[in-house]
Amino acid sequence: KSPIFGPEEVNSVEGNSVSITCYYPPTSVNRHTRKYWCRQGARGGCITLISSEGYVSSKYAGRANLTNFPENGTFVVNIAQLSQDDSGRYKCGLGINSRGLSFDVSLEVSQGPGLLNDTKVYTVDLGRTVTINCPFKTENAQKRKSLYKQIGLYPVLVIDSSGYVNPNYTGRIRLDIQGTGQLLFSVVINQLRLSDAGQYLCQAGDDSNSNKKNADLQVLKPEPELVYEDLRGSVTFHCALGPEVANVAKFLCRQSSGENCDVVVNTLGKRAPAFEGRILLNPQDKDGSFSVVITGLRKEDAGRYLCGAHSDGQLQEGSPIQAWQLFVNEESTIPRSPTVVKGVAGGSVAVLCPYNRKESKSIKYWCLWEGAQNGRCPLLVDSEGWVKAQYEGRLSLLEEPGNGTFTVILNQLTSRDAGFYWCLTNGDTLWRTTVEIKIIEGEPNLKVPGNVTAVLGETLKVPCHFPCKFSSYEKYWCKWNNTGCQALPSQDEGPSKAFVNCDENSRLVSLTLNLVTRADEGWYWCGVKQGHFYGETAAVYVAVEERKAAGSRDVSLAKADAAPDEKVLDSGFREIENKAIQDPRLFAEEKAVADTRDQADGSRASVDSGSSEEQGGSSR
């Protein structure tokens, strides 16, 4: 027997859509072989209608697609705008049509239920609103208006003009009688439930002269949209529920056991702990649509997600919803990168950020995730030379090592720097990673003086002490600016005496500035690296003043604070500075970003918080 499995019978009605899932053993060969959907002919052949290699028959043009989910061993055929001509016997299969690797599917498309003559069909999504219009004649204008629902053989009163409301509809139904000019009354039902579906009868008058109108209400539960994303990548759920719920609280939840749908995030400020640091709910548009970005996808993130609107900020019966089935592909193209980087107060961290190597020219960004409200990610630095003012002299984004990785260095760490940071680009929105910076106990490994004052026209020598653990590393001094840190010549002065229990392999490397000018004022970093991979750094601010007495200045470590005082950042520290990553449209489909530095997007960023790898900073 064939190992392919699927639905034996699919039944639907004209105008509807079907989504047919075919299951296959997910062997390496099966995953990559051709998938097809064909129609069986009377003589036994099977004519391909759509295949995974891009073929689409003219019969299916613009209304069908085939998506392969190799990780799950499934492929899905979606067919929209069904007609009775689509009824027939089909096969879904692998390889070539005539081989046995297929499954027979019977598709039957009917006209719909036997509706009474003059029946108006209303097709409405679950949770939305329907307005059933009921015309009547002048002689019934003053008579009772009512709506009944056919339950089995009996009509049951739903609402009438005398004020009766069936308990099943309390709080979500009203009967409107139009102005005298219009011979029409309407029944409006909100927050539609699946159980509301069925045959309705509206009536004006109660005697034999009453006017009657039949209505057939179909309530559609949304088919989950299948979403397939890479482990460690990111996913964006775009949720458009319509303007009628623009002012209602929105939520994204994940279905667990039973009826439960656990809130992942909502606009009332709730967020599931598992998504801390890796989720943003983007502000909604005027039409009530919004989007949720989840980065650093983990295996356990796979499942069924619903977005919806309800005043409680969680799924309730009658919530309008959209649904997705998220699959997480473990054969990910996104490389593993540390999810936690540790540093000590006064020390530094160097964070490696992966990006899609095909997009080496894309603009790189680093932002600080904030959990307040629905989450936001104000930019701190980019690869075009912009650095947030409060980070000047202590933050740098370097294109090195390149080929799919850039580096962010942050030094002069304080406890305020602990938190989640996102690496992203203006290119591939799936390549967003999150790293958590933790500030741990310990002393910085590199020792430099505190602030240093140089004298115009004189020579300044600034020492940097490297412990023996860095004996095999390249040691450097550089001058910080917005675009990076320009290397400067430095002198190895031999072993350092700044470390206890450290042998001859410790080093004192000095920066010498000859004939100091005003242009020499600024931040200088000493640091270590191995090839293009950066390690720890320490920063010194050099101020320049007028000459007081002749001579050169040689700054000793004693004059400095080993760990600089924690800076008290002004209250604007966490403000948006119109650099917050919010607007989902910017990095999404529109790759041409107007001026990304003024409007950058966190709506689609990504992390590997799913891995427990850690990267040390200044101290382990």
Epitope: N11, V13, N72, Q218, L220, K221, E317, Q325
Partner: nanobody
Amino acid sequence: EVQLVESGGGLVQTGGSLRLSCAASGRTFSSYAMGWFRQAPGKEPERDFVAALRWSNDRTYYKYYADSVKGRFTISRDNAKNTVYLQMNTLKPEDTAVYYCAGGNYFSDPRVDKEYNYWGQGTQVTVSS
């Protein structure tokens, strides 16, 4: 919570027929996948897939069957009664088992019992030769 109650089991001769019913009650608004599984004597805790029905609205539904019951068993539902049926024809002794009704919000694979959220208590079907 959703409750599922099976009925219709019993003793039948080889070649005979039975119709099992599974009535759902409670908060069923998002249950739209129902399946039948069976557990043969001495096979605990293994439950084998028999048939499943998934619907996306009142007008679109999908029926799945295990190879062993194809052509003999039919799954159907009565939406108004919130009930799913399993019509079993041409019964064989190897169909003897406890039959369980299962319900869920959505399944990735109808054959996998873990994908269903609710289960009934089971009804015994015995086919004698």
